[in-house]
């Protein structure tokens, strides 16, 4: 169990800042598994703070190893039955100590949130959570307080009156050999799977179930607007009329009723009617990883951290996987170096984001007088006579492509090629058929196409000459 710098995240740092010794404490918050994991939502299942906290001192130039967690357990009492699925929020807070602290200074070092599934009475579950440059190793479990037992702490047990057997009609409580199931005190018909009771003749429902006997899934309930079915009737009631019902105190504050109203006892670092205001200001240096603190210049104004690219969270404590945004174009490989992103480009591409196509005409010229032609996302060189290859760098045999049509003979020449045409043809490439009577030449049809009617063709051609 430790809190310290994660692997590969640079030189470990002491959690204390420049103002001398500090100590860490932990706030554990439980939220229903179905609730939003947003910071604002209440710790509806319960919250608690660590108590015994060792003091850490800053030793300049010395690396901070993983810090031991405070001794002892953080106990979070939960209301009603244990839901099985829940959100676990663990915040690591720093308290600045000493004469240079300038009064109590609290700020959030790290906050980890995770959805968890856990039955009550099971073994310790181990976990590792990373956030920003910190890593938290911890264990957690859920236990029922006697006389409750079971995965949801919904069954009541009591000690056996005799070592060998339970009373008439009562079964032993598993997995507790020395205890018996308590006599059924719940309302008759209360669902043994989805209901439980703490007082005689009541039937309280586990999460997801409703109705007088907890037999109706929540989605099919006819009660609207947060109302729940009333006991032994079809009417609907507003849940919990007590001022502390639903715990109006935010951030782990504990609620107490005072003459029809409520009062919140706020944990360290928070204040306000509902503990909704953080006592941290910019003076406490709450922004991590190079974040800039905006606002919070006096105790009544909240601060906001503007995070450098690559970090997020209310205190810039969370590292963003910037490569997940796929910033590298054209199939480039993304590397997040922490201080910057790098793209390793595929062959033929360049630029900070591989955005430059070296195969386009802007990237490279064609040699030996060739001209660049773009098309279909690539480029090719149209080479001058006597040259060939990808960049027109190779000397070419101009006659290799058989450029002379209709049986003309090709002769290589210093300036290119010369075609000696077969009888009846003329033109630079012997492309024109010559009429015997000396009329206009007719371009020969490309191979594979039907020859056009020469009379009609010539008629139009002559028309243009008038």
């Amino acid at each position: 169990h430790s809190f310290g710098p994660g692997p590969g995240l640079g030189t470990p740092r002491s959690p204390c800042n420049a103002r001398g010794p500090c100590r860490l404490f932990f706030r554990v918050c439980l939220k229903p598994g179905v609730s939003q994991e947003a910071t604002e939502s209440l710790c509806a299942l319960g919250a608690a703070l660590s108590t015994s906290v060792p003091v850490y001192t800053e030793h300049p130039g010395e690396s901070a190893a993983a810090l031991p967690l405070p001794d002892g357990l953080v106990r979070v009492p939960f209301r009603d039955a244990w839901p099985g699925t829940f959100s676990l929020v663990i915040e690591t807070w720093r308290e600045q100590l000493g004469e240079h602290a300038g009064g109590p200074a609290w700020n959030l070092l790290a906050r980890v949130v995770g959805r968890r599934r856990l039955a009550a009475g099971g073994p310790w579950a181990r976990d590792v959570q990373r956030t920003g440059t910190w890593e938290l190793h911890f264990s957690y479990r859920a236990r029922c307080e006697p006389p409750a037992v079971g995965a949801a702490c919904a069954r009541l047990c009591r000690s056996r009156s005799a070592p060998s057997r339970c009373g008439p009609g009562l079964r032993p409580c598993t997995p507790f050999p020395d205890e018996c199931e308590a006599p059924s005190v719940c309302r008759p018909g209360c669902s043994p799977e989805h209901g439980y009771c703490e007082e005689p003749d009541e039937c309280r429902c586990l999460e997801g179930w409703t109705g007088p006997l907890c037999t109706v899934p929540v989605s099919t309930s006819s009660c609207l607007n947060s109302r729940v079915p009333g006991p032994a009737s079809t009417g609907c009631l507003l849940p919990g009329p007590g001022p502390c019902d639903g715990n109006p105190c935010a951030n782990g504050g504990s609620c107490s009723e005072t003459s029809g109203s409520f009062e919140c006892a706020c944990p360290r670092g928070f204040y306000g009617l509902r503990c909704e205001v953080s006592g941290v200001t910019c003076a406490d240096g709450p922004c991590f990883n190079g974040g800039l603190c905006v606002g919070g210049e006096d105790p009544d104004s909240a601060y906001v951290c503007h995070c450098p690219p690559g970090f997020q969270g209310s205190n810039c404590e969370k590292r963003v996987d910037r490569c997940s945004l796929q910033p590298c174009q054209n199939g480039g490989l993304c590397l997040d170096l922490g201080h910057a992103l790098r793209c390793r480009c595929r062959a033929g591409f360049a630029g900070p984001r591989c955005e430059h196509d070296l195969d386009d005409c802007a990237g490279r010229a064609c040699a030996n007088g060739g001209t660049c032609v773009e098309g279909g996302g690539s480029r090719r060189c149209s080479c001058a006579l006597g040259f060939g290859g990808r960049d027109c760098r190779e000397r070419a045999d101009p006659c290799a492509s058989r450029p002379c049509a209709h049986g003309g003979r090709c002769y290589a020449h210093f300036s290119g090629l010369v075609c000696a045409c077969a009888p009846g043809y003329m033109g630079v490439r012997c492309e024109f058929a010559v009429r015997p009577d000396g009329a206009d030449a007719v371009p020969a049809a490309p191979r594979g196409l039907r020859q056009a009617d020469p009379q009609r063709f010539l008629h139009h051609h002559h028309h243009h000459h008038h």
């Epitope: 800042n17 420049a18 103002r19 300038g102 910019c282 003076a283 240096g285 922004c287 990883n289 190079g290 974040g291 800039l292 603190c293 905006v294 606002g295 503007h306 450098p308 690219p309 690559g310 910033p327 922490g338 201080h339 910057a340 992103l341 630029g351 900070p352 984001r353």
Partner: antibody
Framework: QVQLQESGPGLVKPSETLSLTCTVS????????WSWIRQPPGKGLEWIGY???????NYNPSLKSRVTMSVDTSKNQFSLKLSSVTAADTAVYFC????????????WGQGTMVTFSS | EIVLTQSPGTLSLSPGERATLSCRAS???????LAWYQQKPGQAPRLLIY???SRATGIPDRFSGSGSGTEFTLTISRLEPEDFAVYYC?????????FGQGTRLEIK
Amino acid sequence: QVQLQESGPGLVKPSETLSLTCTVSNVSISSYYWSWIRQPPGKGLEWIGYIYYSGTTNYNPSLKSRVTMSVDTSKNQFSLKLSSVTAADTAVYFCARLSNWGFAFDIWGQGTMVTFSS
Amino acid sequence: EIVLTQSPGTLSLSPGERATLSCRASQTISSSYLAWYQQKPGQAPRLLIYGASSRATGIPDRFSGSGSGTEFTLTISRLEPEDFAVYYCQQYGWSPITFGQGTRLEIK
């Protein structure tokens, strides 16, 4: 290498609005915060504000009521508008890039001198 | 806002000597959030040091930064002719971002 180039008028009449543009080369404007800083003749540096491509801005409170910044990602440019200018706004105006490990200025433009006079 | 006060206003030294420039903050700054710049006439400032003690890319190792809390120092171990310029400190932990008024380092 990354380059920043300021552009805009060198002379602006008092009470008018100054408009400057900074063109960014060889890096995507979406990857960093971008800032404006000014320096009156013979004096020190004054931070004006910064902007991120997402639209996040932060302005110096002393200038906030007169400053507007914007980003054009398609042109890889960001701009500054300073309204109701006076002779006291005469300065060299620099655009700069904020580093990715904190809000220090790691790349600067060469600056453009703007004088406010009728 | 955090006010940064630099001292001395002007420092006259010879090449080869050691220069020590001071920057004092009106409130505590996390040591991660202080930078130093060098500016020569007619040029833009150049980042030398960030995070109070980390050298920026391409900065010679004769430049070093130190300090924490409210007291920060820039040291140039052996002055070269090209080091004579104006030096500014800047804090970037708390908005508004602020600069010191500068220290002019001149040839004696």
